[in-house]
Protein backbone atom coordinates (compact mmCIF):
# COMPACT_ATOMS: atom_id res chain seq x y z
CA UNK A 1 0.00 0.00 0.00
CA UNK A 2 1.20 3.48 -0.75
CA UNK A 3 1.30 6.26 1.80
CA UNK A 4 -0.24 8.82 -0.50
CA UNK A 5 -3.95 9.57 -0.14
CA UNK A 6 -6.36 11.40 -2.37
CA UNK A 7 -7.88 14.61 -0.99
CA UNK A 8 -10.25 16.89 -2.84
CA UNK A 9 -8.55 20.29 -2.85
CA UNK A 10 -10.51 23.26 -1.58
CA UNK A 11 -11.33 26.04 -4.08
CA UNK A 12 -8.41 28.47 -4.27
CA UNK A 13 -8.92 31.69 -2.34
CA UNK A 14 -7.82 34.98 -3.87
CA UNK A 15 -5.17 35.36 -1.18
CA UNK A 16 -3.90 31.74 -1.40
CA UNK A 17 -0.12 31.53 -1.51
CA UNK A 18 1.83 28.73 -3.18
CA UNK A 19 4.72 28.56 -0.68
CA UNK A 20 2.85 26.90 2.20
CA UNK A 21 4.56 26.00 5.45
CA UNK A 22 4.87 22.52 6.96
CA UNK A 23 2.06 20.15 6.11
CA UNK A 24 -0.28 22.63 4.45
CA UNK A 25 -1.61 21.69 1.01
CA UNK A 26 -3.15 25.14 0.48
CA UNK A 27 -2.81 28.23 2.61
CA UNK A 28 -3.29 31.98 2.83
CA UNK A 29 -1.14 34.68 4.36
CA UNK A 30 -3.98 35.74 6.66
CA UNK A 31 -5.62 32.38 7.63
CA UNK A 32 -2.61 30.05 7.57
CA UNK A 33 -3.38 26.51 6.39
CA UNK A 34 -6.62 26.03 4.47
CA UNK A 35 -6.14 22.32 3.74
CA UNK A 36 -3.60 19.70 4.70
CA UNK A 37 -1.42 17.11 3.02
CA UNK A 38 -2.54 13.46 3.29
CA UNK A 39 -2.54 11.85 6.75
CA UNK A 40 -2.45 15.24 8.51
CA UNK A 41 -5.16 16.76 10.68
CA UNK A 42 -6.56 20.25 10.21
CA UNK A 43 -7.00 22.28 13.40
CA UNK A 44 -7.68 25.91 14.22
CA UNK A 45 -5.28 27.65 16.57
CA UNK A 46 -6.33 30.85 18.28
CA UNK A 47 -3.70 33.58 18.15
CA UNK A 48 -5.07 36.68 19.87
CA UNK A 49 -8.33 37.57 18.14
CA UNK A 50 -7.42 35.57 15.05
CA UNK A 51 -7.82 31.85 14.26
CA UNK A 52 -5.05 30.28 12.19
CA UNK A 53 -5.36 26.96 10.38
CA UNK A 54 -2.60 24.45 11.20
CA UNK A 55 -1.84 20.93 9.97
CA UNK A 56 -0.87 18.37 12.62
CA UNK A 57 0.60 14.91 12.25
CA UNK A 58 -1.59 13.78 15.16
CA UNK A 59 -4.32 15.37 17.22
CA UNK A 60 -3.32 16.96 20.54
CA UNK A 61 -4.13 15.28 23.85
CA UNK A 62 -7.84 15.45 24.57
CA UNK A 63 -8.73 15.33 20.87
CA UNK A 64 -9.27 12.53 18.37
CA UNK A 65 -8.96 12.41 14.60
CA UNK A 66 -11.88 12.07 12.22
CA UNK A 67 -11.42 11.40 8.52
CA UNK A 68 -13.50 12.94 5.78
CA UNK A 69 -12.84 12.71 2.04
CA UNK A 70 -11.53 16.25 1.80
CA UNK A 71 -10.19 16.91 5.31
CA UNK A 72 -9.07 15.23 8.53
CA UNK A 73 -10.31 17.01 11.66
CA UNK A 74 -9.44 16.99 15.33
CA UNK A 75 -12.49 16.68 17.58
CA UNK A 76 -12.58 17.04 21.37
CA UNK A 77 -12.92 13.94 23.56
CA UNK A 78 -15.69 13.87 26.18
CA UNK A 79 -15.25 16.17 29.20
CA UNK A 80 -14.24 13.31 31.57
CA UNK A 81 -11.72 11.87 29.11
CA UNK A 82 -8.03 12.72 28.60
CA UNK A 83 -7.27 10.66 25.49
CA UNK A 84 -9.65 8.83 23.17
CA UNK A 85 -10.17 7.17 19.81
CA UNK A 86 -13.59 8.82 19.62
CA UNK A 87 -16.31 10.12 21.95
CA UNK A 88 -17.48 6.58 22.77
CA UNK A 89 -14.03 5.04 23.22
CA UNK A 90 -11.92 6.75 25.86
CA UNK A 91 -8.43 5.36 26.45
CA UNK A 92 -7.46 7.46 29.50
CA UNK A 93 -9.84 9.17 31.90
CA UNK A 94 -9.41 12.46 33.70
CA UNK A 95 -8.41 12.36 37.38
CA UNK A 96 -11.11 10.91 39.63
CA UNK A 97 -12.62 8.66 36.96
CA UNK A 98 -12.06 4.96 36.26
CA UNK A 99 -11.80 3.55 32.74
CA UNK A 100 -14.01 0.60 31.87
CA UNK A 101 -14.72 -0.57 28.32
CA UNK A 102 -13.88 2.83 26.88
CA UNK A 103 -16.11 4.72 29.32
CA UNK A 104 -15.13 6.91 32.30
CA UNK A 105 -16.96 5.99 35.50
CA UNK A 106 -17.15 7.49 39.00
CA UNK A 107 -17.34 4.01 40.51
CA UNK A 108 -16.60 0.58 39.15
CA UNK A 109 -19.51 -1.77 38.34
CA UNK A 110 -20.44 -4.74 40.53
CA UNK A 111 -17.88 -7.55 40.35
CA UNK A 112 -15.04 -5.21 39.42
CA UNK A 113 -12.63 -3.21 41.55
CA UNK A 114 -10.83 0.08 41.05
CA UNK A 115 -7.12 -0.08 40.32
CA UNK A 116 -5.87 3.26 41.65
CA UNK A 117 -2.54 2.87 39.86
CA UNK A 118 -3.90 2.42 36.33
CA UNK A 119 -7.23 4.17 37.12
CA UNK A 120 -9.13 1.29 35.53
CA UNK A 121 -11.91 -1.01 36.63
CA UNK A 122 -10.40 -4.49 36.76
CA UNK A 123 -11.67 -7.98 37.47
CA UNK A 124 -11.36 -9.13 41.07
CA UNK A 125 -8.50 -11.63 41.17
CA UNK A 126 -8.58 -14.39 43.77
CA UNK A 127 -5.50 -16.11 45.14
CA UNK A 128 -4.39 -19.23 43.32
CA UNK A 129 -1.95 -21.72 44.83
CA UNK A 130 -0.18 -24.72 43.36
CA UNK A 131 -0.57 -28.31 44.51
CA UNK A 132 1.44 -29.20 47.63
CA UNK A 133 5.04 -30.25 46.99
CA UNK A 134 6.06 -33.60 48.56
CA UNK A 135 6.73 -33.73 52.30
CA UNK A 136 10.33 -32.99 53.30
CA UNK A 137 12.38 -35.74 55.05
CA UNK A 138 11.44 -36.31 58.69
CA UNK A 139 13.96 -34.51 60.92
CA UNK A 140 14.62 -33.78 64.59
CA UNK A 141 16.71 -30.66 65.15
CA UNK A 142 18.05 -30.96 61.64
CA UNK A 143 18.95 -34.66 61.97
CA UNK A 144 17.32 -37.50 60.06
CA UNK A 145 18.51 -40.22 62.51
CA UNK A 146 18.13 -41.28 66.13
CA UNK A 147 14.79 -43.09 66.71
CA UNK A 148 13.01 -39.86 67.60
CA UNK A 149 9.78 -38.14 66.81
CA UNK A 150 10.45 -35.29 64.40
CA UNK A 151 8.73 -32.97 61.98
CA UNK A 152 8.27 -32.86 58.24
CA UNK A 153 7.24 -29.87 56.15
CA UNK A 154 5.67 -29.31 52.78
CA UNK A 155 5.20 -26.12 50.79
CA UNK A 156 3.18 -24.83 47.86
CA UNK A 157 3.65 -21.78 45.65
CA UNK A 158 1.40 -18.79 45.08
CA UNK A 159 0.52 -18.87 41.37
CA UNK A 160 -1.70 -15.76 41.44
CA UNK A 161 -1.56 -13.07 44.11
CA UNK A 162 -5.02 -11.71 44.94
CA UNK A 163 -6.19 -8.21 44.09
CA UNK A 164 -7.47 -5.89 46.84
CA UNK A 165 -10.94 -7.46 46.93
CA UNK A 166 -9.80 -10.99 46.08
CA UNK A 167 -9.77 -14.01 48.40
CA UNK A 168 -6.65 -14.17 50.56
CA UNK A 169 -4.09 -16.91 50.06
CA UNK A 170 -4.29 -20.04 52.23
CA UNK A 171 -1.15 -21.14 54.15
CA UNK A 172 1.74 -22.06 51.89
CA UNK A 173 3.67 -24.03 54.57
CA UNK A 174 2.48 -27.04 56.54
CA UNK A 175 4.37 -28.94 59.25
CA UNK A 176 3.37 -32.19 60.95
CA UNK A 177 4.79 -34.73 63.43
CA UNK A 178 6.57 -37.79 62.15
CA UNK A 179 8.95 -40.52 63.24
CA UNK A 180 12.60 -40.15 62.28
CA UNK A 181 13.83 -43.27 60.49
CA UNK A 182 15.22 -45.94 62.85
CA UNK A 183 18.95 -45.69 62.34
CA UNK A 184 21.74 -44.78 64.71
CA UNK A 185 23.38 -41.42 64.23
CA UNK A 186 26.92 -41.57 62.89
CA UNK A 187 29.72 -39.69 64.65
CA UNK A 188 29.15 -35.96 64.21
CA UNK A 189 25.48 -36.53 63.48
CA UNK A 190 24.36 -36.25 67.13
CA UNK A 191 22.10 -33.44 68.23
CA UNK A 192 23.68 -30.27 69.65
CA UNK A 193 23.94 -29.99 73.44
CA UNK A 194 22.77 -27.44 75.94
CA UNK A 195 20.96 -24.23 75.19
CA UNK A 196 21.84 -24.52 71.47
CA UNK A 197 19.30 -27.33 71.29
CA UNK A 198 16.41 -24.96 71.99
CA UNK A 199 13.82 -25.19 69.22
CA UNK A 200 13.70 -22.37 66.72
CA UNK A 201 10.39 -20.50 66.62
CA UNK A 202 8.17 -21.63 63.70
CA UNK A 203 7.63 -19.40 60.69
CA UNK A 204 4.50 -17.28 60.56
CA UNK A 205 3.21 -19.20 57.54
CA UNK A 206 3.19 -22.58 59.34
CA UNK A 207 -0.25 -23.80 60.39
CA UNK A 208 -0.62 -23.90 64.21
CA UNK A 209 -2.29 -27.28 64.21
CA UNK A 210 0.64 -28.80 62.39
CA UNK A 211 3.37 -27.20 64.55
CA UNK A 212 4.52 -29.84 67.03
CA UNK A 213 4.92 -29.15 70.75
CA UNK A 214 8.60 -29.66 71.76
CA UNK A 215 7.63 -31.79 74.81
CA UNK A 216 5.54 -34.17 72.73
CA UNK A 217 8.45 -34.67 70.39
CA UNK A 218 10.60 -36.25 73.11
CA UNK A 219 10.73 -40.00 72.51
CA UNK A 220 10.42 -42.48 75.38
CA UNK A 221 12.98 -44.71 73.67
CA UNK A 222 16.28 -43.03 74.49
CA UNK A 223 19.90 -44.10 74.35
CA UNK A 224 21.53 -44.00 77.87
CA UNK A 225 24.04 -41.47 76.60
CA UNK A 226 21.20 -39.16 75.60
CA UNK A 227 19.57 -39.59 79.05
CA UNK A 228 22.79 -38.37 80.65
CA UNK A 229 22.84 -35.40 78.39
CA UNK A 230 19.33 -34.60 79.50
CA UNK A 231 20.23 -34.67 83.19
CA UNK A 232 23.19 -32.41 82.53
CA UNK A 233 20.89 -30.09 80.64
CA UNK A 234 18.42 -29.95 83.54
CA UNK A 235 21.22 -29.09 85.97
CA UNK A 236 22.46 -26.38 83.65
CA UNK A 237 18.96 -24.96 83.29
CA UNK A 238 18.58 -24.69 87.08
CA UNK A 239 21.98 -22.99 87.29
CA UNK A 240 21.03 -20.64 84.52
CA UNK A 241 17.78 -19.73 86.28
CA UNK A 242 19.63 -19.00 89.52
CA UNK A 243 22.12 -16.86 87.64
CA UNK A 244 19.36 -14.90 85.94
CA UNK A 245 17.56 -14.39 89.26
CA UNK A 246 20.70 -13.10 90.94
CA UNK A 247 21.33 -10.82 87.99
CA UNK A 248 17.80 -9.47 88.09
CA UNK A 249 18.12 -8.50 91.83
CA UNK A 250 21.01 -6.19 90.99
CA UNK A 251 18.64 -3.85 89.05
Amino acid sequence: QNASRGRRQRRMHPNVSQGCQGGCATCSDYNGCLSCKPRLFFALERIGMKQIGVCLSSCPSGYYGTRYPDINKCTKCKADCDTCFNKNFCTKCKSGFYLHLGKCLDNCPEGLEANNHTMECVSIVHCEVSEWNPWSPCTKKGKTCGFKRGTETRVREIIQHPSAKGNLCPPTNETRKCTVQRKKCQKGERGKKGRERKRKKPNKGESKEAIPDSKSLESSKEIPEQRENKQQQKKRKVQDKQKSVSVSTVH
Partner: antibody, heavy 117, light 111 residues
Framework: QVQLVQSGAEVKKPGASVKVSCKAS????????IHWVRQAPGQGLEWIGY????????GYNQKFKNRVTMTRDTSTSTAYMELSRLRSEDTAVYYC??????????WGQGTTLTVSS | DIVLTQSPASLAVSLGQRATITCKAS??????????MNWYQQKPGQPPKLLIY???NLESGIPARFSGSGSGTDFTLTINPVEAEDVATYYC?????????FGAGTKLELK
Protein backbone atom coordinates in the same frame (compact mmCIF):
# COMPACT_ATOMS: atom_id res chain seq x y z
CA GLN B 1 5.93 4.65 2.10
CA VAL B 2 4.40 3.33 5.32
CA GLN B 3 5.56 -0.19 6.14
CA LEU B 4 5.03 -2.53 9.07
CA VAL B 5 7.37 -5.53 9.10
CA GLN B 6 6.64 -8.32 11.57
CA SER B 7 8.87 -11.03 13.04
CA GLY B 8 8.89 -14.58 11.68
CA ALA B 9 6.70 -17.60 12.40
CA GLU B 10 6.77 -19.15 15.88
CA VAL B 11 6.05 -22.64 17.20
CA LYS B 12 5.37 -22.84 20.93
CA LYS B 13 4.26 -25.42 23.49
CA PRO B 14 1.11 -24.90 25.57
CA GLY B 15 1.85 -22.82 28.66
CA ALA B 16 4.75 -20.98 27.04
CA SER B 17 4.92 -17.30 26.00
CA VAL B 18 5.55 -15.63 22.65
CA LYS B 19 6.71 -12.11 21.79
CA VAL B 20 5.93 -10.80 18.30
CA SER B 21 7.56 -7.65 16.94
CA CYS B 22 6.32 -5.06 14.44
CA LYS B 23 8.86 -2.62 12.99
CA ALA B 24 7.39 0.57 11.55
CA SER B 25 8.90 2.82 8.88
CA UNK B 26 7.82 5.55 6.45
CA UNK B 27 6.11 7.73 9.07
CA UNK B 28 6.69 9.16 12.55
CA UNK B 29 6.26 6.14 14.82
CA UNK B 30 4.81 8.14 17.72
CA UNK B 31 2.02 9.72 15.64
CA UNK B 32 -0.44 6.81 15.52
CA UNK B 33 -1.49 4.03 17.84
CA ILE B 34 -0.56 0.50 16.84
CA HIS B 35 -3.15 -2.24 17.23
CA TRP B 36 -2.88 -6.02 17.18
CA VAL B 37 -5.46 -8.25 15.50
CA ARG B 38 -5.40 -12.03 15.16
CA GLN B 39 -6.96 -14.52 12.78
CA ALA B 40 -7.30 -18.21 13.63
CA PRO B 41 -7.04 -20.66 10.68
CA GLY B 42 -10.11 -20.29 8.46
CA GLN B 43 -11.67 -17.84 10.92
CA GLY B 44 -12.46 -14.12 11.14
CA LEU B 45 -10.52 -11.23 12.66
CA GLU B 46 -10.28 -10.60 16.38
CA TRP B 47 -8.99 -7.39 17.98
CA ILE B 48 -6.44 -7.89 20.79
CA GLY B 49 -5.57 -4.34 21.84
CA TYR B 50 -3.50 -1.23 21.19
CA UNK B 51 -0.47 0.76 22.30
CA UNK B 52 0.28 4.47 21.97
CA UNK B 53 3.95 4.57 20.94
CA UNK B 54 4.25 8.19 22.15
CA UNK B 55 3.86 7.31 25.85
CA UNK B 56 3.54 3.52 26.01
CA UNK B 57 -0.07 3.58 27.24
CA UNK B 58 -1.90 0.44 26.20
CA GLY B 59 -5.36 -1.07 26.35
CA TYR B 60 -6.51 -4.63 25.77
CA ASN B 61 -9.61 -6.54 24.80
CA GLN B 62 -10.97 -7.95 28.12
CA LYS B 63 -10.69 -11.43 26.63
CA PHE B 64 -6.89 -11.15 26.59
CA LYS B 65 -6.36 -8.75 29.51
CA ASN B 66 -4.59 -11.15 31.88
CA ARG B 67 -2.37 -12.72 29.21
CA VAL B 68 -1.26 -9.95 26.86
CA THR B 69 1.36 -7.21 27.24
CA MET B 70 2.10 -4.59 24.59
CA THR B 71 5.30 -2.59 24.65
CA ARG B 72 7.28 -0.43 22.25
CA ASP B 73 10.84 0.74 21.62
CA THR B 74 10.78 4.24 20.14
CA SER B 75 14.52 4.11 19.34
CA THR B 76 13.88 1.33 16.80
CA SER B 77 10.25 2.25 15.96
CA THR B 78 9.18 -1.25 17.00
CA ALA B 79 6.01 -2.39 18.77
CA TYR B 80 5.82 -5.72 20.60
CA MET B 81 2.97 -7.96 21.61
CA GLU B 82 3.62 -10.68 24.19
CA LEU B 83 1.05 -13.40 24.82
CA SER B 84 1.57 -15.72 27.80
CA ARG B 85 0.10 -19.01 29.04
CA LEU B 86 -0.42 -20.11 25.44
CA ARG B 87 -3.06 -22.68 24.54
CA SER B 88 -3.86 -24.46 21.29
CA GLU B 89 -6.69 -21.96 20.56
CA ASP B 90 -4.03 -19.22 20.28
CA THR B 91 -2.83 -20.78 17.01
CA ALA B 92 -3.40 -17.93 14.56
CA VAL B 93 -1.86 -15.29 12.34
CA TYR B 94 -1.13 -12.17 14.39
CA TYR B 95 -1.21 -8.78 12.63
CA CYS B 96 -0.11 -5.34 13.74
CA UNK B 97 -1.82 -2.33 12.15
CA UNK B 98 -1.66 1.45 12.35
CA UNK B 99 -4.89 3.09 13.51
CA UNK B 100 -5.57 6.31 11.69
CA UNK B 101 -8.71 8.23 12.65
CA UNK B 102 -10.70 5.14 13.61
CA UNK B 103 -9.64 2.67 10.94
CA UNK B 104 -6.78 0.26 10.35
CA UNK B 105 -5.13 1.71 7.28
CA UNK B 106 -1.76 -0.10 7.18
CA TRP B 107 -1.13 -3.70 8.21
CA GLY B 108 1.92 -5.85 8.83
CA GLN B 109 2.35 -9.03 6.76
CA GLY B 110 1.34 -11.20 9.72
CA THR B 111 3.16 -13.59 12.06
CA THR B 112 2.01 -17.20 12.21
CA LEU B 113 1.93 -18.67 15.71
CA THR B 114 1.44 -22.41 16.15
CA VAL B 115 0.77 -23.72 19.66
CA SER B 116 1.20 -27.48 19.84
CA SER B 117 2.49 -30.05 22.31
CA ASP C 1 -19.62 -5.95 22.92
CA ILE C 2 -21.10 -4.79 19.63
CA VAL C 3 -21.83 -7.88 17.52
CA LEU C 4 -21.63 -7.47 13.76
CA THR C 5 -23.65 -9.96 11.71
CA GLN C 6 -22.65 -10.22 8.07
CA SER C 7 -24.81 -11.75 5.37
CA PRO C 8 -24.57 -13.75 3.31
CA ALA C 9 -21.67 -15.88 4.61
CA SER C 10 -20.70 -16.59 1.00
CA LEU C 11 -21.75 -15.14 -2.30
CA ALA C 12 -21.26 -16.29 -5.92
CA VAL C 13 -21.59 -13.56 -8.54
CA SER C 14 -20.99 -13.49 -12.29
CA LEU C 15 -18.36 -11.17 -13.70
CA GLY C 16 -19.82 -7.74 -14.39
CA GLN C 17 -22.73 -8.26 -11.98
CA ARG C 18 -23.46 -6.48 -8.71
CA ALA C 19 -22.45 -7.96 -5.33
CA THR C 20 -24.17 -6.72 -2.17
CA ILE C 21 -22.95 -7.56 1.35
CA THR C 22 -24.79 -6.41 4.46
CA CYS C 23 -23.58 -5.87 8.01
CA LYS C 24 -26.00 -5.49 10.92
CA ALA C 25 -24.73 -4.15 14.27
CA SER C 26 -26.29 -5.21 17.58
CA UNK C 27 -26.41 -1.51 18.53
CA UNK C 28 -25.84 1.80 16.78
CA UNK C 29 -22.29 2.63 15.74
CA UNK C 30 -23.13 6.28 15.03
CA UNK C 31 -22.09 9.26 17.11
CA UNK C 32 -22.29 13.00 16.44
CA UNK C 33 -23.41 12.34 12.87
CA UNK C 34 -20.46 10.06 12.10
CA UNK C 35 -20.78 6.33 11.43
CA UNK C 36 -17.88 4.33 12.83
CA MET C 37 -18.09 1.49 10.34
CA ASN C 38 -15.29 0.33 8.03
CA TRP C 39 -15.01 -2.34 5.33
CA TYR C 40 -11.93 -4.46 4.54
CA GLN C 41 -11.00 -6.87 1.79
CA GLN C 42 -8.77 -9.87 2.50
CA LYS C 43 -7.23 -12.19 -0.05
CA PRO C 44 -5.73 -15.58 0.96
CA GLY C 45 -2.29 -15.24 2.57
CA GLN C 46 -2.54 -11.44 2.76
CA PRO C 47 -3.45 -8.97 5.51
CA PRO C 48 -6.78 -7.14 5.26
CA LYS C 49 -6.94 -3.97 3.16
CA LEU C 50 -9.09 -0.93 3.99
CA LEU C 51 -11.75 -0.24 1.33
CA ILE C 52 -14.33 2.04 2.95
CA TYR C 53 -14.05 4.17 6.09
CA UNK C 54 -16.79 5.96 8.06
CA UNK C 55 -19.50 3.88 6.33
CA UNK C 56 -19.37 5.52 2.91
CA ASN C 57 -15.94 7.05 2.18
CA LEU C 58 -13.75 5.37 -0.38
CA GLU C 59 -10.16 4.84 0.73
CA SER C 60 -7.49 6.37 -1.51
CA GLY C 61 -6.44 4.06 -4.34
CA ILE C 62 -9.55 1.85 -4.13
CA PRO C 63 -11.55 1.52 -7.40
CA ALA C 64 -14.85 3.41 -7.59
CA ARG C 65 -16.79 0.17 -8.20
CA PHE C 66 -16.66 -0.26 -4.40
CA SER C 67 -19.16 1.76 -2.43
CA GLY C 68 -20.53 1.80 1.12
CA SER C 69 -23.77 3.04 2.59
CA GLY C 70 -25.85 2.92 5.74
CA SER C 71 -26.01 4.37 9.23
CA GLY C 72 -26.98 3.37 12.76
CA THR C 73 -27.13 -0.42 12.72
CA ASP C 74 -27.49 -1.32 9.04
CA PHE C 75 -24.65 -1.05 6.55
CA THR C 76 -24.01 -2.25 3.00
CA LEU C 77 -20.95 -2.82 0.85
CA THR C 78 -21.64 -2.88 -2.88
CA ILE C 79 -19.26 -3.99 -5.65
CA ASN C 80 -20.55 -3.05 -9.09
CA PRO C 81 -19.44 -4.40 -11.49
CA VAL C 82 -17.61 -7.36 -9.96
CA GLU C 83 -14.20 -8.12 -11.46
CA ALA C 84 -12.07 -11.28 -11.20
CA GLU C 85 -9.62 -9.59 -8.79
CA ASP C 86 -12.45 -8.95 -6.30
CA VAL C 87 -12.56 -12.63 -5.28
CA ALA C 88 -11.79 -12.34 -1.55
CA THR C 89 -13.36 -12.29 1.90
CA TYR C 90 -14.93 -9.00 3.02
CA TYR C 91 -15.19 -7.86 6.65
CA CYS C 92 -17.10 -5.04 8.30
CA UNK C 93 -15.58 -3.51 11.46
CA UNK C 94 -16.92 -1.06 14.02
CA UNK C 95 -14.70 1.41 15.85
CA UNK C 96 -17.38 3.17 17.88
CA UNK C 97 -16.86 1.23 21.11
CA UNK C 98 -14.39 -0.85 23.10
CA UNK C 99 -13.76 -3.61 22.16
CA UNK C 100 -13.34 -3.04 18.44
CA UNK C 101 -15.16 -5.85 16.64
CA PHE C 102 -15.32 -7.41 13.17
CA GLY C 103 -18.04 -9.24 11.31
CA ALA C 104 -17.49 -12.95 10.59
CA GLY C 105 -16.75 -12.22 6.93
CA THR C 106 -18.40 -12.79 3.55
CA LYS C 107 -16.61 -14.88 0.96
CA LEU C 108 -17.08 -13.60 -2.58
CA GLU C 109 -16.65 -16.13 -5.40
CA LEU C 110 -17.26 -16.04 -9.12
CA LYS C 111 -20.17 -17.96 -10.68
Amino acid sequence: QVQLVQSGAEVKKPGASVKVSCKASGYTFTDYSIHWVRQAPGQGLEWIGYIYPSNGDSGYNQKFKNRVTMTRDTSTSTAYMELSRLRSEDTAVYYCATYFANNFDYWGQGTTLTVSS
Amino acid sequence: DIVLTQSPASLAVSLGQRATITCKASQSVDYDGDSYMNWYQQKPGQPPKLLIYAASNLESGIPARFSGSGSGTDFTLTINPVEAEDVATYYCQQSNEDPLTFGAGTKLELK
